[in-house]
Amino acid sequence: QGWQAFKNDATEIIPELGEYPEPPPELENNKTMNRAENGGRPPHHPFETKDVSEYSCRELHFTRYVTDGPCRSAKPVTELVCSGQCGPARLLPNAIGRGKWWRPSGPDFRCIPDRYRAQRVQLLCPGGEAPRARKVRLVASCKCKRLTRFHNQSELKDFGTEAARPQKGRKPRPRARSAKANQAELENAY
């Protein structure tokens, strides 16, 4: 089909790329997210330094085929789905009728993607169309994150298996850029 990807196994067609973090929504110290400067890791936030045992953010492995229109990946890809209730584990009783239910107090924490990886896949298409070459963005790890009023709730949804084309007037962004130059943009992204 015009290309071959391999290392030791000449049939390999789903090479993986390195992991990298999604840009954080806010950088209080205004440092840039230049990989070469900080290794690609966002600065720690004070509310994330608690004992991890206070949180229950589960990473569920999920295997699926990648599709783009009628085309489907030759092999399935594996990524994580972030699941579970995040602490801190302070719970307050709330009476509803005769029973009680419990809800966390304090800031709203969510279990969300922390790091992503890019994986190159080849999609096989019907009708003699050439296989499509794609790099997909897959969740590599999860973390408990405090939501702020800036966060876009719609972005908590899992990624679909269908390709999302860039919206009109909205520019796809490079995966690593200066936080200072893109502060407003980052406020709506994890």
């Epitope: 391999f6 993986e16 790329l17 070469a36 296989p131 070459a133 390709a163 999302a164 995966r175």
Partner: antibody, heavy 127, light 107 residues
């Protein structure tokens, strides 16, 4: 600043091999794929293949399959492209280029562009 | 392999002119197309990715459009520094083939 610096010009005889190096600086070498592109004098650009510096995985255009090998040395942030069994039509300027990926939040796929290029290495194949 | 063709192969224009270059793919590539500018003796420079998105630092007089098999690069008002060769590249299927280039020179 982000840059790719390639090795110097080479003159080779038909049948020989050439190995061109591409040293990255100003960014994390293992975070971006490297593509190799060549251009014969007065001709258009010709894509040869890509390499993932993190895993060492590669993908080559079928035209070069069996003759080209793309490798890397992460300790010195350098990518290499070796072309063997050289013939006169391989005379060209060889470029390494960084493959940037652009995404829209919530999108499944990345968008492609070669955003940083090496200065080019002229390879002349002549008997 | 997907074949990329460009027209015209060359165009003579004056400063201030509007220039349109067409790129055609031999099969549907959706919006998986990039445009590059190359000046004599220089390295290619990325102008447009995903068919219509302007690369950071590229002047807004450059724009790209199209989807499927037909694409255009438009320079709204040609500047002296824009005289160069422009090439398209498809990134839909391996190998990522380039068009032959369109040379924009001074009339």
């Amino acid at each position: 600043q982000v840059q790719l610096v390639q090795s110097g010009a080479e003159v080779k005889k038909p049948g020989a091999s050439v190995k061109v190096s591409c040293k990255a600086s100003g960014y994390t070498f293992t975070s971006y794929d490297i593509n190799w592109v060549r251009q014969a004098t007065g001709q258009g650009l010709e894509w040869m293949g890509w390499m993932n510096p993190n895993s060492g995985k590669t993908g080559y255009a079928q035209k070069f399959q069996g003759r080209v090998t793309m490798t890397r040395d992460t300790s010195i942030s350098t990518a290499y492209m070796e072309l063997s069994s050289l013939r006169s039509e391989d005379t060209a300027v060889y470029y390494c280029a960084r493959e940037e990926e652009y995404y829209e939040s919530g999108s499944l796929f990345y968008y492609y562009g070669l955003d940083v290029w090496g200065q080019g290495t002229t390879v002349t194949v002549s008997s | 392999d997907i074949q990329m063709t460009q027209s015209p192969s060359s165009v003579s224009a004056s400063v201030g002119d509007r220039v349109t270059i067409t790129c055609r793919a031999s099969q549907d590539i959706s919006n998986w197309l990039a445009w590059y500018q190359q000046k004599p003796g220089k390295v290619p420079k990325l102008l447009i990715y995903a068919a219509s998105y302007l690369q950071s630092g590229v002047p807004s007089r450059f724009s790209g459009s199209g989807s499927g098999t037909d694409f255009t690069l438009t320079i709204s008002s040609l500047q002296p520094e824009d005289f160069a060769t422009y090439s398209c590249q498809q990134a839909n299927s391996f190998p990522f083939t380039f068009g032959p280039g369109t040379k924009v020179d001074i009339k």
